[in-house]
Interface confidence: low
């Protein structure tokens, strides 16, 4: 079969499974005159052998671990053994299979881990290696935790990442791990050939000891601290520790207050720097946070609460420069005139607070003193001895004094005897008719006007006159002002009419005074009157049951995904068509007959979180009236983003020749979200051809330092590979370059001559 | 003493396809970040793509999936194949070894895009 097995000499490629026992010929090369033999040379290992004729074979099997790639060449030769063709060369590759186990670097790992640390941060990674193809599942590991000892209520404390083999804790153990109940931990980890997923895969097992250590970096309990302190500041009030020394200790305010009085010292101490005014701010929140020597943040931060402990620092305050009352002529005795309320401003049902009140006087003392009484803790006003008479004193003044346990307050009262009210509202109509409304009608709109009469004094709480409607609306649609002059009612709207739920209402008016009627009056059918308000429909959009909808996902979830839902009714019972709007990224459609969001493309919390778009919903039907509402959806961030040089660093420079190994820092960034801790990059060099001139090392999260290991560098640019790896999950890796230029300088300046460059270097090292 | 040889300029019909070449002399070439600039009437020069030592490769955007850049070590050539050209190509393009604006540049060959 001429083409497959055979052929003229040309440059091939073959690939072959190790192990494989040789059963077959790899080719057959055919000779063009004057060649008559072939002869190979190369990577043979004695294995590969080409017969005069041409045909080449191998003749044993083969092992990729020794050699994954042989480099043969083939020529051809004329009958003096002269080359004639070639060589060419002929590359056979050589297939993996499962033919090594994997084998763990360690038969015993230690390490150690501090309670509450970060669920899934590593705190120690087991290795294993495999001599199979790694990018072949033959090479591909798997690492499991096969038992954790003590096992406490059957809760794992310890989770492996089964590709990296990295150990941390787990949510539960992040929150349970206590070294005073249980000090250490051992795992057995096992790790798999075939990415874990065959039967016939290799394995081998490792021991790892775990101590757990206490972590001091707990919020204290909270403080109490009493109001208008008199002692020197800065008082401590308490303290937090970080678990090694060295820390940088800060408080951050969240709430911006204009006056933020607390420290923290460099031992972790805090103190209340002012004294605290309990009727400004009665409690404090704030957070302690621990930093490294470069800033970066060593842990979540700690919530700090002050309570502020009241003093009795407040007088009792009057409810106003005179409180006026009214009683009518033939009050009873014990009847209620009023209540006077004084305020105090110390904490509430505390002594600091709690109000007494006494009558100190009474003018005029006509008939006689001591007419009123009040409750001494409720400031209730009561009739005390006898009916009054308007004719011999129309007005009363009272000084009450008001006290809490260390105050005393005077407010002043004034009662003013009115006439009896024995008179009742009489409506000047009793049916105000028929009144027919659009339901659109605004609200506000003054419907319908209405009039009662009362025949009592003046002005007074006997001749005011308050409309209520007892009947007819009990949804509150309708309310009434009265004009305090004339006693005129005027009907207004307070909240939308709706045809659908109240096409016709029976509204029934009652009349009342605010002062009670005498003994033996009531109210009669004069003080009531009605009217019947019929509404007419109007054609309504469609409602949304929120005026906002929000719906939270993780941006890498699969296109096609239910994201959320919207739900809308029509007045007029029609049905509902959904769509979207201002959707300008294309990530969402809508279900035009349910309301379900789905997404239909990859979405991104770094383009913008919330995504926010609308949501219209249109009448079938009908006058195809719509509504719009608005749809958030929140996107949960995932590991998608690799890191990146956080700025440009073109222009970098050292002169030429360097006089020492110079190094230079740089920074890296990434566009995920980082809470409270920040990234936690680690840096490498980009490929290992650079480690002779260059060494990179990490200063702390997102800086490292890029150092030169010799001074012997031509006078030209330097492109440095850097891998800058997040350490996410799942870790992404970016790899970013670094030009670094070595040049004659002058006056601490790069200098090239002219037709080199087209800038000019900014930065020297 | 560097020098940096372009050749495979020319003149070319949108949508057409042009490779140009860049022999490198004076360098451990294997060493250097190599790449393309252009320079159009009137405008800064730019760099165009660029290829690192260990082969990775970087495009500026508007010519992102167009244009690629390769190597061959054992030649000391850096190659740029132009696919899918449009009349905006027109410039003069450099060789550039170092891989940025502060790096070596050749003399240029012309392309010129135009129906």
């Known amino acids: 079969q001429e083409g497959k097995f055979s052929g003229p000499l040309k440059p091939m490629t073959f690939s072959i499974y190790e192990g494989q026992e040789p059963s077959q010929i790899i080719f057959q090369f055919k000779a063009n005159p004057p060649a008559v033999t072939f002869e190979l040379t190369g990577e043979t290992d004695n294995i590969f052998v080409i017969e005069r004729e041409g045909l080449l074979y191998y003749n044993r099997a083969l092992d990729r671990e020794t050699r994954s790639t042989h480099n043969l060449q083939v020529a051809a030769l004329d009958a003096n053994g002269i080359i004639v063709e070639g060589p060419v060369p002929i590359t056979i590759k050589v297939k993996d299979i499962n033919d090594n186990r994997p084998t763990f670097l360690q038969s015993k790992y230690e390490g150690s881990v501090r309670q509450n640390s970060r669920p899934g941060k590593p705190f120690l990674y087991v290795n294993a290696t495999d001599l199979d193809d790694p990018a072949t599942p033959n090479g591909q590991l798997y690492y499991q935790i096969v038992i954790q000892l003590p096992m406490i209520n059957n809760v794992m404390y310890f989770q492996i990442n089964n590709k990296t083999g990295a150990i941390s804790l787990t949510r539960e153990g992040s929150q349970e791990l206590n070294p005073a109940k249980n000090p250490s931990y051992n795992l057995v980890i096992s790790v798999k050939d075939m990415g874990g997923q065959s039967e016939n895969s290799f394995s081998d097992t490792t021991s790892v000891d775990i101590i757990v250590t206490e972590n001091i970096w707990k919020a204290p309990k909270p403080v109490e601290m009493v109001e208008n302190s008199t002692d020197p500041h800065p008082i401590k009030i308490t303290q937090v520790r970080w678990n090694d020394p060295g820390a940088q200790y800060s408080l951050v305010d969240k709430e911006k207050l204009p006056r933020f009085p607390f420290s923290i010292d460099q031992e972790g101490d805090i103190y209340v720097t002012q004294p605290l005014d309990r009727e400004e701010k009665d409690a404090y929140v704030f957070y302690a946070v621990a930093k490294d020597e470069y800033g970066k943040p060593l842990s979540y931060p700690l919530e700090i609460h002050v309570k502020v402990k009241d003093i009795n620092d407040n007088p009792p305050t009057c409810p106003s420069p005179v409180t006026v009352f009214e009683v009518q002529e033939n009050e009873r005795l014990g009847n209620s005139i009023g209540t006077l309320t004084a305020h105090d401003r110390d904490e509430e049902n505390t002594a600091n607070s709690f109000l007494n009140y006494r009558i100190v006087e009474q003018t005029p003392k006509l008939p006689m003193d001591g007419l009123f009484l009040i409750q001494t803790y409720a400031g209730m006003l009561q009739l005390a001895k006898q009916s009054l008479k308007k004719q011999d004193t129309p007005q009363y003044n009272l000084t009450i004094e008001v006290s809490d346990k260390d105050f005393k307050t005077l407010c002043f009262v004034q009662i003013n005897v009115i006439d009896i009210n024995d008179q009742i509202p009489i409506f000047e109509k009793s049916d105000y008719g028929n009144l027919t409304l659009a339901e659109d009608t605004n609200i506000g709109s003054t419907i319908l006007t209405i009039q009662a009469t009362d025949a009592d004094e003046p002005f007074t709480g006997s001749s005011k006159i308050l409309y209520h409607i007892i009947k007819g609306d009990s949804e509150g649609r309708l309310g009434v002002d009265t004009d305090p002059h004339t006693n005129t009612g005027y009907v207004i709207i307070k909240k939308p009419l709706d045809f659908e739920t109240a096409a016709v209402s029976n509204i029934v008016f009652k009349a009342e005074n605010p002062e009670p009627l005498v003994f033996g009056v009531k109210y009669n059918a004069s003080s009531f009157a009605k009217f019947t308000l019929i509404v007419t429909d109007v054609n309504e959009a469609p409602q949304f049951s929120q005026h906002v909808f929000q719906a939270k996902v993780s941006e890498d979830v699969a296109i096609g995904t239910k994201v959320g839902n919207v739900t809308a009714k029509d007045p007029e019972g029609l049905d509902i068509s959904y769509s979207l709007r201002g959707d300008t990224r294309g990530w969402l459609k809508i279900d035009h007959v349910t309301g379900e969001i789905f997404s239909v493309a990859p979405l991104d919390r770094e383009a913008g979180s919330p995504y926010r778009v609308q949501v219209v919903a249109t009448e079938v039907g009908g006058s195809s009236l719509s509504s719009v509402s608005e749809f958030h959806l929140i996107l949960m961030d995932v590991n998608d983003n690799p890191p990146r040089l956080a700025k440009d660093y073109t222009g970098l420079f050292f002169c030429h020749p360097l006089s020492a190994p110079g190094s230079l820092i740089f920074e890296a960034t990434d566009d995920d979200q980082h809470l409270f801790r920040g990234p936690h990059f680690t840096f490498s060099l980009g490929s290992g051809s650079l480690q002779n001139d260059w060494e990179v090392s990490k200063i702390n999260g997102t800086h490292a330092r890029l150092s030169t290991r010799h001074t012997e560098f031509e006078e030209r640019e330097y492109v440095v590979l850097i891998r800058i790896n997040d350490g996410g999950r799942p870790p992404l890796e970016g790899i970013v370059s670094l030009p670094v230029t070595f040049c004659s300088c002058v006056e601490g300046s790069c200098f090239r001559p002219a037709g080199h460059q087209t800038g000019i270097p900014t930065v020297g090292m | 003493e560097v020098q940096l040889v372009e050749s495979g300029g020319g003149l070319v019909q949108p949508g057409g396809s042009l490779r140009l070449s860049c022999a490198a002399s004076?360098?451990?070439?294997?060493?250097?970040?190599m790449g393309w600039g252009r320079q159009a009437p009137g405008k800064q020069r730019e760099l165009v793509a660029s290829?690192?030592?260990?082969?990775?490769?970087n495009y500026a955007d508007s010519v992102k999936g167009r244009f690629t850049i390769s190597r061959d070590n054992a030649k000391n050539t850096v190659y740029l194949q132009m696919n899918s050209l449009r009349p905006e190509d027109t410039a003069v393009y450099y060789c550039?070894?170092?891989?940025?604006?502060?790096?070596?540049w050749g003399q240029g060959t012309q392309v010129t895009v135009s129906s």
């Open positions: 550039n070894a170092g891989g940025g604006a502060l790096g070596y």
């Open positions: 004076g360098i451990r070439f294997s060493r250097y970040a």
């Open positions: 290829i690192f030592i260990d082969d990775t490769t």
